[in-house]
């Protein structure tokens, strides 16, 4: 009785259970009543990452420097090339097909999380007691200066963009 289902790493064709080709190899010929599945290794710059019955291997991804990309991990016959972005840039998607410049946090905002090759800068508004007076991809919100610890008094209140201005205490006459 011909099989209707096959074991793991097999596929059904012409009422035969044929072995799938292992990762890194492509199908050249299905198995028959007389022969085992015939597979061949993927060529240079090609890969297949699963047990498969593909007649063509996939091309390795090209990390295009014109798009700000560089190779993070070279592909093998079983894995695709992994691209990442040049310093100061990050991927626009999970597939990392192009890069954009890391965003800077405007004055009044500080860096909550520094950008990586795959994620953009995350900014947060400076809360009361903190400020940022620069546009930066690295600077966090800084705490206002504590005038008291310097034996000074606040002459001008701080904002989310400016530090407090301290001055000498008025002398009692």
């Amino acid at each position: 009785e011909p099989p209707t289902a096959c074991r793991e790493k097999q596929y059904l064709i012409n009422s035969q259970c044929c072995s799938l080709c292992q990762p890194g190899q492509k199908l050249v010929s299905d198995c028959t009543e007389f022969t085992e599945t015939e597979c061949l290794p993927c060529g240079e710059s090609e890969f297949l990452d699963t047990w498969n019955r593909e007649t063509h291997c996939h091309q390795h991804k090209y990390c295009d420097p014109n798009l700000g990309l560089r190779v993070q991990q070279k592909g093998t016959s079983e894995t695709d090339t992994i691209c990442t972005c040049e310093e100061g840039w990050h991927c626009t998607s999970e597939a990392c097909e192009s890069c954009v410049l890391h965003r800077s946090c405007s004055p009044g905002f500080g860096v909550k999380q520094i950008a990586t090759g795959v994620s953009d800068t995350i900014c947060e508004p400076c809360p009361v007691g903190f400020f940022s007076n620069v546009s930066s991809a690295f600077e966090k919100c800084h705490p206002w200066t504590s005038c008291e610890t310097k034996d000074l008094v606040v002459q001008q209140a701080g904002t989310n963009k400016t530090d407090v201005v301290c001055g000498p205490q008025d002398r009692l006459r």
């Epitope: 012409n14 009422s15 035969q16 072995s19 050249v28 010929s29 299905d30 028959t32 009543e33 007389f34 022969t35 085992e36 015939e38 007649t55």
Partner: antibody, heavy 115, light 112 residues
Framework: QVQLVQSGAEVKKPGASVKVSCKAS????????IYWVRQAPGQGLEWIGG????????NFNEKFKSRATLTVDTSISTAYMELSRLRSEDTAVYYC????????WGQGTTVTVSS | DVVMTQSPLSLPVTLGDPASISCRSS???????????LHWYQQRPGQSPNHLIY???NRFSGVPDRFSGSGSGTDFTLKISRVEAEDVGVYFC?????????FGGGTKLEIK
């Protein structure tokens, strides 16, 4: 239905070459190997080799590797077997065959080598 | 090369009787994938060979169930439970586990 139709009988002199054709129909030609087998008069069967029409890849019986050439023309779904430097012992019926979802044979081509 | 030895060479049988043909290989035909690529053919006079059984015991579509195959390793048998007139011809075993593929010398079945 699957059919393999071979070329007609050939008479050749020793030292000559012969090219036998096998036209396939009724299935996707590139999906299955074509194999060649011969049978000398009153004798058993002898495997010559096979060719994968998808990529032209071949496998051979070492005995025939230096004299047999297997080719295909996918545009007309035809396989060819050429045997060179013929000798009298090559007198035989030559069959093409295909297997996978059943086994199919050509009708055979008689090749006679005689001076 | 793997040598396939068939016996008997000739097999005279009475119609309706059983028949048995033996095939021995010079080395095991068990493939690394677990299959055994031993097959049986029938060749009627003046015709191309016709496959009966593949991988020891699997009948091809349209082959009568009076034909059966058995065996393992190096020792194989083709049985015909009740011989009919149309069964006359030469029977070959062959192996496709090892390259080159090889055939037995044939067993001629005839009616007594």
């Amino acid at each position: 239905q699957v059919q393999l139709v071979q070329s007609g009988a050939e008479v050749k002199k020793p030292g000559a070459s012969v090219k036998v054709s096998c036209k396939a129909s009724g299935y996707t030609f590139i999906s299955y190997y074509i194999y060649w087998v011969r049978q000398a008069p009153g004798q058993g069967l002898e495997w010559i080799g096979g060719i994968n029409p998808r990529n032209g890849g071949t496998n051979f019986n070492e005995k025939f590797k230096s004299r047999a050439t297997l080719t295909v023309d996918t545009s007309i779904s035809t396989a060819y077997m050429e045997l060179s430097r013929l000798r009298s012992e090559d007198t035989a019926v030559y069959y093409c065959t295909r297997h996978g979802n059943g086994v199919y044979w050509g009708q055979g081509t008689t090749v006679t080598v005689s001076s | 090369d793997v040598v396939m030895t068939q016996s008997p060479l000739s097999l005279p049988v009475t119609l309706g009787d059983p028949a048995s043909i033996s095939c021995r290989s010079s080395q095991s035909l068990l493939h690394s994938n677990g299959n055994t690529y031993l097959h049986w053919y029938q060749q009627r006079p003046g015709q191309s060979p016709n496959h009966l059984i593949y991988q020891v015991s699997n009948r091809f579509s349209g082959v009568p169930d009076r034909f059966s195959g058995s065996g393992s390793g190096t020792d194989f048998t083709l049985k015909i439970s009740r011989v009919e007139a149309e069964d006359v011809g030469v029977y070959f075993c062959s192996q496709t586990t090892h390259v080159p593929w090889t055939f037995g010398g044939g067993t001629k079945l005839e009616i007594k």
